[in-house]
């Protein structure tokens, strides 16, 4: 049986504003119409769910209102943006893709994108 390959960049550096973007691309074995994308963060051996969205092919990704993630989809490619990152959020961000409909269900898990976040230096106090 075919595995479902999920590709994502190995390393991404967050911007000085704490925003990181990367592409999660999956090789779909069939014509999925409903796809679920989950971003997981792995630090040491602990894994936490960062955000998740289910979308219909051709439609926009919709994350929860309070989510730190936004994204767009194009074919088998999902462009993910994570905001509000700080240095302590540095870690391996794993893209999990599930083809929910039509059957059969498929699961694919990427190798992860190491996101480095560097907190900006505070501005020096001014004498003015």
């Amino acid at each position: 049986c075919k595995a479902m390959h999920v590709a994502q960049p190995a390393v991404v550096l967050a911007s000085s504003r704490g925003i990181a973007s990367f592409v999660c691309e999956y090789a779909s074995p069939g014509k999925a119409t409903e796809v679920r994308v989950t971003v997981l963060r792995q630090a040491d051996s602990q894994v936490t769910e960062v955000c998740a969205a289910t979308y219909m092919m051709g439609n926009e990704l919709t994350f929860l209102d309070d989510s730190i993630c936004t994204g767009t989809s194009s074919g088998n490619q999902v462009n993910l943006t994570i905001q509000g990152l700080r240095a302590m959020d540095t870690g391996l961000y794993i893209c999990k893709v599930e083809l929910m409909y039509p059957p059969p269900y498929y699961l694919g898990i990427g190798n992860g994108t190491q996101i480095y976040v560097i907190d900006p230096e505070p501005c020096p106090d001014s004498d003015f």
């Epitope: 075919k2 595995a3 479902m4 792995q42 051996s45 999990k96 059957p103 699961l107």
Partner: nanobody, 128 residues
Framework: EVQLVESGGGLVQVGDSLRLSCAAS????????IGWFRQAPGKEREFVAT????????????YYADSVKGRFTISGDNSKNTVYLQMTSLKPEDTAVYYC?????????????????WGQGTQVTVSS
């Protein structure tokens, strides 16, 4: 080579609960997906639930057949190399031989053809 042994089956009443166990030996199952399937007399083998791990972590991802969603829960104990299927609110139509199987950690996890290793099965009978 992975050997799988199921246990916990039996005769129960409608509405009762039962917990099935699938013990793996020969290799750690954290690099596999473990699936539960069932086969009722005169029917084809059908998918019930599956669990898969992100390597080197305790994070698991699960998926269920619509017919058991909300009633059955699949879980795993890596230290014991055992996967459990907790079944509640059992119905007569849940009567079947339940098999556990091991296959690749990603891919079409609801298809029995994905799984290369199978246990001998355990009988579950729900009487009204």
């Amino acid at each position: 080579e992975v050997q799988l042994v199921e246990s916990g089956g039996g005769l129960v009443q409608v509405g009762d609960s039962l917990r099935l166990s699938c013990a793996a030996s020969g290799r750690s199952f954290e690099n596999y997906a473990i699936g539960w399937f069932r086969q009722a007399p005169g029917k084809e083998r059908e998918f019930v639930a599956t669990i898969s791990w992100i390597p080197r972590t305790a994070y698991s991802t699960t998926y269920y057949a619509d017919s058991v969603k909300g009633r059955f829960t699949i879980s795993g104990d890596n230290s014991k190399n055992t996967v459990y299927l907790q079944m509640t609110s059992l119905k007569p139509e849940d009567t079947a031989v339940y098999y556990c199987a091991a296959g690749g950690a990603t891919g079409p996890l609801a298809l029995d053809s994905h799984y290369g290793y199978w246990g001998q099965g355990t009988q579950v009978t729900v009487s009204s």
